[in-house]
Amino acid sequence: VPPGEDSKDVAAPHRQPLTSSERIDKQIRYILDGISALRKETCNKSNMCESSKEALAENNLNLPKMAEKDGCFQSGFNEETCLVKIITGLLEFEVYLEYLQNRFESSEEQARAVQMSTKVLIQFLQKKAKNLDAITTPDPTTNASLLTKLQAQNQWLQDMTTHLILRSFKEFLQSSLRALRQM
């Protein structure tokens, strides 16, 4: 099933092309399905999903998170601010998705699909935000050193990092999906 298509949603071949908001909605749901599959492997492989030591590892990560000031929540919603936050957040997640690439055995293709689908999603959203102020892109040098640092962690921390990235990315996408439905 191609990125952005969900087998249970595939409609008749004569249907008109998807509009931008439809593509975005389907793309996010496709990525969320991928994350679910990756989380399943992670949770089967270790006990990280039940661990109470998450906070320790979370302190070392700077994973994008929705905050009130980002304007993506029901109270204080702001379409422009929120759209910028979603795109910026996804761009920041890219280095963490790169880290995930060598972290899966049976779901290696799924990890690649999540990464590539996220790149496509960013392109969709950038088109939607073409009239907004410039969106800051993470510094490649900083990303490279972060990746090196993450890959140098011990096994326990790498497992925990994988778990936290997937959980945070899922929460970020779910918040984005709800917000985008008011756009």
Epitope: A11, A12, T19, Q74, F77, E80, L177, M183
Partner: antibody, heavy 120, light 111 residues
Amino acid sequence: EVQLVESGGGLVQPGGSLRLSCAASGFTFSSYAMSWVRQAPGKGLEWVSRISSGGISTYYADSVKGRFTISRDNAKNTLYLQMNSLKPEDTAVYYCVRYAWGVQWAFDFWGQGTQVTVSS
Amino acid sequence: NFMLTQPPSVSGSPGKTVTISCAGTSSDVGYGNYVSWYQQLPGTAPKLLIYNVNKRASGITDRFSGSKSGNTASLTISGLQSEDEADYYCASYRTGDNAAFGGGTKLTVLG
């Protein structure tokens, strides 16, 4: 308490124009996408137009495309529908509706409607 | 504009169960979980009953339930009461960023 109060309806000749307004209160107006839905006398409901929460995106039914314009003023908590080149088939009660938060295409609050009659 | 297909009328006795169907295509009802149902009492604005196919709106009794199979959605009203007498409309997202409504079904509670 959520309230949506429409105004601006009336009798207009074919080819004429009208501007409908919807005053919203009891919720954070700028957080919600909004729509106009109409109901011809004794007929069913017909979706007319939608506008995103910040007014960036607008959508129209084919039957009104190019003639109607939806807009909003979040500072005034007001939704508008500018109707030009009106036709007799545009005669209906026009409802201002709110989209449910985080749900696609479900309308959780409706105004009481304003009557638009297009007749010579 | 495109319209979803509903039966013009249904009826049932108090305490009984009635089901209203809403037939569409793979471009609307069958496209995703974007079906909602509305109740319109005489002379009033419509009211949301069900959204996302089967989720009840706030304050709606569990006598109302929704389901979907393929390109057809259904609204089931159990334990019919006289105050349920109204017009019922289904609505669905339609590809192309439109919404489609059904033609409406008039429910009559007998007796």
